[in-house]
Amino acid sequence: RKAVLDCEAMKTNEFPSPCLDSKTKVVMKGQNVSMFCSHKNKSLQITYSLFRRKTHLGTQDGKGEPAIFNLSITEAHESGPYKCKAQVTSCSKYSRDFSFTIVDPVTSPVLNIMVIQTETDRHITLHCLSVNGSLPINYTFFENHVAISPAISKYDREPAEFNLTKKNPGEEEEYRCEAKNRLPNYATYSHPVTMPSTGGDSCPFCLK
């Protein structure tokens, strides 16, 4: 009788579809992820099953708490789609599909500097390029650890460019750039490049 009641409940909104989610939607290969399958009904003992395409990944029982499935994303096909099933006795409902976006992390970018020196000014062009990592890549340029450019988005494997003009400085300036893509909390920096102060003929990056 209980099975009949549960099935009847499922025909109403008392037993809606479960929800499948993850705190991390953008991942890199080799990353561990947790997937949460939850249900609005907190009083029923629910059996949760997780599927990817047409393979079964695991089953857990839960009441009131979401089922947590821990996975490692090591191959491209593991991006999904995933779905979970909530089952009570002989009745079940499925979540909507969930897929991860797999992104290759950016490698440390290379910063190149070109300078045109005049009597009073330095016209500086900064180039920054990360040769590996999923596009688009956002580049930001720094001078003495302070951002001097907005984020420059590159959708191709071309260097980001930033121009600035400075009065001939009296002290050294240190430049570096940051490369970052959709991977959260994952940014890489170039080696710093130091621009010496204007004393005599000390402008190694200058175009004569």
């Epitope: 990817r52 395409r53 047409k54 393979t55 079964h56 695991g58 096909h77 099933k85």
Partner: antibody, heavy 119, light 112 residues
Framework: EVQLVESGGGLVQPGGSLRLSCAAS????????ITWVRQAPGKCLEWIGT???????YYSTWAKGRFTISRDNSKNTVYLQMNSLRAEDTAVYYC?????????????WGQGTLVTVSS | AIQMTQSPSSLSARVGDRVTITCQSS????????LSWYQQKPGKAPKLLIY???RLASGVPSRFSGSGSGTQFTLTISSLQPEDFATYYC????????????FGQGTKVEIK
């Protein structure tokens, strides 16, 4: 070349045990699912059980308890342990590989190994 | 237990004939389309023809097609060729009582 090779079949007495091997080459068992299927002489195909890329195992109702599927990743080999064998277990036993993330779309098959249960 | 009923169990046909084989499941397959079709010739291992109920496996001639959803599925050979005389099986995947698979009992296609 992607292939599966079964071995370990032969004549066994009723009540006896046998372990079949399925050696995989050209791909990794940590990505693909392997399924065991059998076919009695002149009869239809019968699903025995499956081991997926995560090592989870699934069995048909009649095979549960008597048959056990395992794998050795270092040898890239899957095993079918068969206990308490009966005359009706006489069949050609196949192992087959599924598509990635599709356990039962069996696109690569071994040649089969014959198991005869008789006294 | 899940029953996968194939019909007919055998049929006789001529080269060039259109042949239809059906598979009726006692329960819906997973995702409504977790069904594949196989061809088997005597003494040989089965060969995958159709997956996802209607998608043609690699290298399979386009005269083979599949259709259906849920519990009812069909394999059609539009114009039977000499090499098509064989036994055909459906295979369904289920998640209703555990993760489970079941073959149909087969359809033998013979020369008339």
């Amino acid at each position: 070349e992607v292939q599966l090779v079964e071995s370990g079949g032969g004549l066994v007495q009723p009540g006896g045990s046998l372990r079949l091997s399925c050696a995989a080459s050209g791909f990794s068992l940590t990505i693909y699912t392997i399924t065991w299927v059998r076919q009695a002489p002149g009869k239809c195909l019968e699903w025995i059980g499956t081991i997926n890329s995560y090592g989870n195992t699934y069995y048909s109702t009649w095979a549960k308890g008597r048959f056990t599927i395992s794998r050795d990743n270092s040898k890239n080999t899957v095993y079918l342990q068969m206990n308490s064998l009966r005359a009706e277990d006489t069949a050609v036993y196949y192992c087959a590989r599924g598509y990635v993330d599709s356990d039962w779309y069996l696109n690569i098959w071994g040649q089969g190994t014959l198991v005869t249960v008789s006294s | 237990a899940i029953q996968m009923t194939q019909s007919p169990s055998s049929l006789s046909a001529r080269v060039g004939d259109r042949v239809t084989i059906t598979c009726q499941s006692s329960e819906s397959v997973y995702d409504n389309n977790y069904l594949s079709w196989y061809q088997q010739k005597p003494g040989k291992a089965p060969k995958l023809l159709i997956y996802d109920a209607s998608r043609l496996a690699s290298g399979v001639p386009s005269r083979f097609s599949g259709s259906g959803s849920g519990t009812q599925f069909t394999l059609t050979i539009s114009s039977l060729q000499p090499e098509d005389f064989a036994t055909y099986y459906c295979l369904g995947g289920y998640d209703s009582s555990g993760w489970y698979a079941a073959f149909g009992q087969g359809t033998k296609v013979e020369i008339k």
